[in-house]
Amino acid sequence: MMTGTIETTGNISAEKGGSIILQCHLSSTTAQVTQVNWEQQDQLLAICNADLGWHISPSFKDRVAPGPGLGLTLQSLTVNDTGEYFCIYHTYPDGTYTGRIFLEVLESSVAEHGARFQIP
């Protein structure tokens, strides 16, 4: 029976050009975690395997860094990185647990402030 729960960073925002850490945590289960997948829609970004460690998909190698922990760091963010990200915990005997994070990438704060505030 699947008793575990996944806590995530939920809805987050970050500045264009910056970086962000995606974090998930599986709790309330004694199941063994054999692998954690990080996915964006149906694209595999990275894998953290209990035996092999980290594998970053070749197309994301330049902008994705493993960790901290089972988390994932996205770098050099662009507006196109806005969207849903999923952490998928493969466990035994429970099976698959999925957490969802929504990331919004904003224009830089300088641009924002310039648009919103007038200097007296």
């Epitope: 699947m2 209990a50 092999l52 005997p93 099976g95 698959t96």
Partner: antibody
Framework: EVQVVESGGGLVKPGGTLKLSCAAS????????MSWVRQSPEQRLEWVAE????????FYSDTVTGRFTISRDNAQNTLYLEMNSLRSEDTAMYYC????????????WGQGTSVTVSS | DVQITQSPSYLAASPGETITINCRAS??????LAWYQEKPGKTNKLLIY???RLQSGIPSKFSGSGYGTDFTLTISSLEPEDFAMYYC?????????FGGGTKVEIK
């Protein structure tokens, strides 16, 4: 070309033992988790056991726990299934299969090796 | 264990037709269902996983849909090589379990 080839099946008496082998080629064996799946004479498929890429995690269906042991030799690119205390209900075609890198399914299967448990 | 009920168990169709095969899980398996093709003398072939993801090298005439408990495999424009046995399998929780299979034969 990815290939997995099973061997070691045969006729065995109830209570007997058998060791199946699966020789893998065409891919980096040590990177992939592997599974054994069996197909009964009635054509029903049943997942039997799984082993992680490095061999540190092994998982079994309740029907074989305590009787079957899955293992692997990454240096020899070979997967094993040691079957003890065999029962008539273990009669089946046994398939070795590779688990996808993302852990979602079984992407390459062998032709199978037949195991018959009968007195 | 999650029980998988596959229907129909037998299906007769003509080349060029579009067919659907259904699988129902005894409880929610999220999107985690795979479809395989079995042919005599050939090794089993993974077609679809995670409900709708097409396995690399599989033609787009095969498509999967569904979520929760109800899933469908659609094969469009049937060709002679598509007449085979098809199985679904849940990969949401252990033990992974399979449907009973659907035999697709030429009408």
């Amino acid at each position: 070309e990815v290939q997995v080839v099973e061997s070691g099946g045969g006729l065995v008496k109830p209570g007997g033992t058998l060791k199946l082998s699966c020789a893998a080629s065409g891919f980096t064996f040590s990177t992939y988790a592997m599974s054994w799946v069996r197909q009964s004479p009635e054509q029903r498929l049943e997942w039997v056991a799984e082993i992680s890429s490095g061999g540190s995690h092994t998982f079994y269906s309740d029907t074989v726990t305590g009787r079957f042991t899955i293992s692997r030799d990454n240096a020899q690119n070979t997967l094993y299934l040691e079957m003890n205390s065999l029962r008539s209900e273990d009669t089946a075609m046994y398939y070795c299969a590779r688990k996808t890198l993302d852990y979602y399914a079984l992407d390459y299967w062998g032709q199978g090796t037949s195991v018959t448990v009968s007195s | 264990d999650v029980q998988i009920t596959q229907s129909p168990s037998y299906l007769a169709a003509s080349p060029g037709e579009t067919i659907t095969i259904n699988c129902r899980a005894s409880k929610s398996i999220s999107k985690y269902l795979a479809w395989y093709q079995e042919k005599p003398g050939k090794t089993n072939k993974l077609l679809i996983y995670s409900g709708s993801r097409l396995q690399s090298g599989i033609p787009s005439k095969f498509s999967g849909s569904g979520y929760g408990t109800d899933f469908t495999l659609t094969i469009s424009s049937l060709e002679p090589e598509d007449f085979a046995m098809y199985y679904c399998q849940q990969h949401n929780e252990y033990p992974w379990t399979f449907g009973g299979g659907t035999k697709v034969e030429i009408k």
